[in-house]
């Protein structure tokens, strides 16, 4: 079998409040009922995890209590958000999608999404 | 379905060799990194070498560089560790793993496999 397909898109600008959203959508090769997905930071090489979790087929995304990430599903499509970014938390954040349950297992990992975070100017103080 | 089987573990004597072999089958993609790996009960699953099927470039842990050798055959898709100078150390189960990665993505970092061999054991005492 050929790699599970796993579409990002290629750029996305986060907000002034350090907010940033984008879609994994995965061709999904049979009926998963469980699904695991993880978003990898790469930058220089080195890659981290940022944040994952594991969902049944039809329910919310379930993120640790202190993740910075919230999500949720429609069919094989993941709708992720990522708080709290500064600008040095630009890179690419990569998805991987494991179908986990019933086997076989797929993997398969998104080519990115370049997030770019631009730190606000702080406001001037006001003579008035 | 995407499977990996290892071979050629053992019992060897510390500075003797052994050479593991992992074929893939299932995966028809031409870009994939493939390595290997190993764990024992006390510590976590560590790389210990690895390739990208495309270009070759490879990877070794810092304490296996100058004695163990990975390579590749894509013909039979099958690669190969050549572990020379084995020591007490080295002992542990050795799995075989795969990425199905693409070019953007960072040469074999363990947080891209997922694809698993069932292990296969080396032992390395007198």
């Known amino acids: 079998c050929k790699a599970m397909h796993v579409a990002q898109p290629a750029v996305v600008l986060a907000s002034s409040r350090g907010i940033a959203s984008f879609v994994c959508e995965y061709a999904s090769p049979g009926k998963a009922t469980e699904v695991r997905v993880t978003v990898l930071r790469q930058a220089d090489s080195q890659v981290t995890e940022v944040c994952a979790a594991t969902y049944m087929m039809g329910n919310e995304l379930t993120f640790l209590d202190d993740s910075i990430c919230t999500g949720t599903s429609s069919g094989n499509q993941v709708n992720l958000t990522i708080q709290g970014l500064r600008a040095m938390d630009t890179g690419l954040y990569i998805c991987k999608v494991e179908l986990m349950y019933p086997p076989p297992y797929y993997l398969g990992i998104g080519n990115g999404t370049q997030i770019y975070v631009i730190d606000p100017e702080p406001c001037p103080d006001s003579d008035f | 379905e995407v499977q990996l089987v290892e071979s050629g573990g053992g019992l060897v004597q510390p500075g003797g060799s052994l050479r593991l072999s992992c074929a893939a089958s299932?995966?028809?993609?031409?870009?994939?990194?493939i390595g290997w790996f190993r764990q024992d009960p006390e510590k976590e699953r560590e790389m210990v070498s690895c390739?990208?099927?495309?270009?070759?470039?490879?990877k070794y842990a810092d304490s296996v560089k100058g004695r163990f050798t990975i390579s590749r055959d894509n013909s039979k898709n099958t690669v190969y560790l050549q572990m020379n100078s084995l020591r007490a150390e080295d002992t542990a189960v050795y799995y075989c793993g795969l990425a199905p990665i693409s070019p953007v993505h960072a040469v074999c970092n363990q947080h891209y496999f997922g694809y698993w061999g069932q292990g296969t054991r080396v032992t390395v005492s007198s």
């Open positions: 390739i990208r099927s495309s270009g070759g470039s490879t």
């Open positions: 299932g995966f028809s993609s031409d870009y994939y990194d």
